[in-house]
């Protein structure tokens, strides 16, 4: 029986060009975590496997860093990175747990834009 729950950072926002940490945490179970997948709806970003270590998809190699822990750091964010991210925890003996994070990548703040175009 699956007793665990996944806690995520939920809905998060970050600025274009910045970085963000995607983090999930599995609690309320003694199941052993053997693999964690980080995914978008149509492609895999990264896998952390207990035996094989980290695998980062070639599409993301330049701007995805493993960790901290079982999390994933996205760097050099673009507006196209806005969307859903899923952590999939493969555990023994429970099975699979899934968490969802929605990331919104924002243009630089209005204040910054204002400062740039201020007339002296």
């Amino acid at each position: 029986m699956m007793t665990g729950t996944i806690e995520t950072t939920g809905n998060i926002s970050a600025e274009k060009g910045g970085s963000i940490i995607l983090q999930c945490h599995l609690s309320s179970t003694t199941a052993q975590v053997t693999q964690v997948n980080w995914e978008q709806q149509d492609q895999l970003l990264a896998i952390c496997n207990a035996d094989l270590g980290w695998h980062i998809s070639p599409s993301f190699k330049d701007r995805v860093a493993p960790g901290p822990g079982l999390g994933l750091t996205l760097q050099s964010l673009t507006v196209n990175d806005t969307g859903e991210y899923f952590c999939i925890y493969h555990t023994y003996p429970d099975g699979t747990y899934t968490g969802r994070i929605f990331l919104e990548v924002l243009e630089s703040s209005v204040a910054e834009h204002g400062a740039r175009f201020q007339i002296p």
């Epitope: 709806q41 492609q43 895999l44 496997n49 094989l52 695998h55 998809s57 599409s59």
Partner: antibody, heavy 117, light 107 residues
Framework: EVQLKQSGAEVKKPGATVKISCKVS????????IHWVQQAPGKGLEWMGY????????KYNETFKGRVTITADTSTDTAYMELSSLRSEDTAVYFC??????????WGQGTLVTVSS | DIQMTQSPSSLSASVGDRVTITCKAS??????VAWYQQKPGKAPKLLIY???YRYTGVPSRFSGSGSGTDFTLTISSLQPEDFATYYC?????????FGAGTKLELK
């Protein structure tokens, strides 16, 4: 209990359009994508595309060259697959499947589409 | 697109035999491979996902292994109900692709 129930068999003429439905029950429809898979007689499985009912986003296999359209009605928990400009090689069984992202634990029973003049 | 090359295309075996089916991906897919069993007139059934994780209710005689480009489905002791067609599928990225299938027949 998760179930995907597809509409019945269809016979169509070349050039026509077919629209197959897949009604789901037993889970929250908007939580997972619905994928469509084609299986021609005696052949293997070919992925056609998916819809994610939460936001209506879709992704298609280029093989079907714009002939396939996948939609979803969240008021009835039903996904649809429409295939246009039918030709004889589209004669196949079409399955809807629920993804755990991109692997499929739940499948519809299949819908046979026969294209014949 | 990622091609999945499955072998053999057909296989004759007896009840109690150990059987191995292989699948080779055209690029590194890490552990993102699933295996399905299909019987005539029925929908496929998920056996294994993420290369080695047995889906709920799947008998322990089915096991999957591999990572990168080379993957294996093993049935440790064939039972009468195991005679069917088996497909591998990469779930790394879209377009999702399947192997051509392995038809397992009674010798």
């Amino acid at each position: 209990e998760v179930q995907l129930k597809q509409s019945g068999a269809e016979v169509k003429k070349p050039g026509a359009t077919v629209k197959i439905s897949c009604k789901v029950s037993g889970y929250t429809f908007t939580d997972q994508a619905i994928h469509w898979v084609q299986q021609a007689p005696g052949k293997g499985l070919e992925w056609m595309g998916y819809i994610y009912p939460r936001d209506g986003s879709t992704k298609y296999n280029e093989t079907f060259k714009g002939r396939v359209t996948i939609t979803a009605d969240t008021s009835t928990d039903t996904a649809y697959m429409e295939l246009s400009s039918l030709r004889s090689e589209d004669t196949a069984v079409y399955f809807c499947a629920r993804g755990m992202l991109r692997w499929f634990a739940y499948w519809g029973q299949g819908t046979l589409v026969t294209v014949s003049s | 697109d990622i091609q999945m090359t499955q072998s053999p295309s057909s296989l004759s075996a007896s009840v109690g035999d150990r059987v191995t089916i292989t699948c080779k991906a055209s690029q590194d897919v890490s552990t993102a491979v699933a295996w399905y069993q299909q019987k005539p007139g029925k929908a496929p059934k998920l056996l294994i996902y993420s290369a080695s994780y047995r889906y709920t209710g799947v008998p322990s005689r089915f096991s999957g292994s591999g990572s990168g480009t080379d993957f294996t489905l093993t049935i440790s002791s064939l039972q009468p109900e195991d005679f069917a067609t088996y497909y591998c599928q990469q779930h790394y990225s879209t377009p999702l692709t399947f192997g051509a299938g392995t038809k397992l027949e009674l010798k």
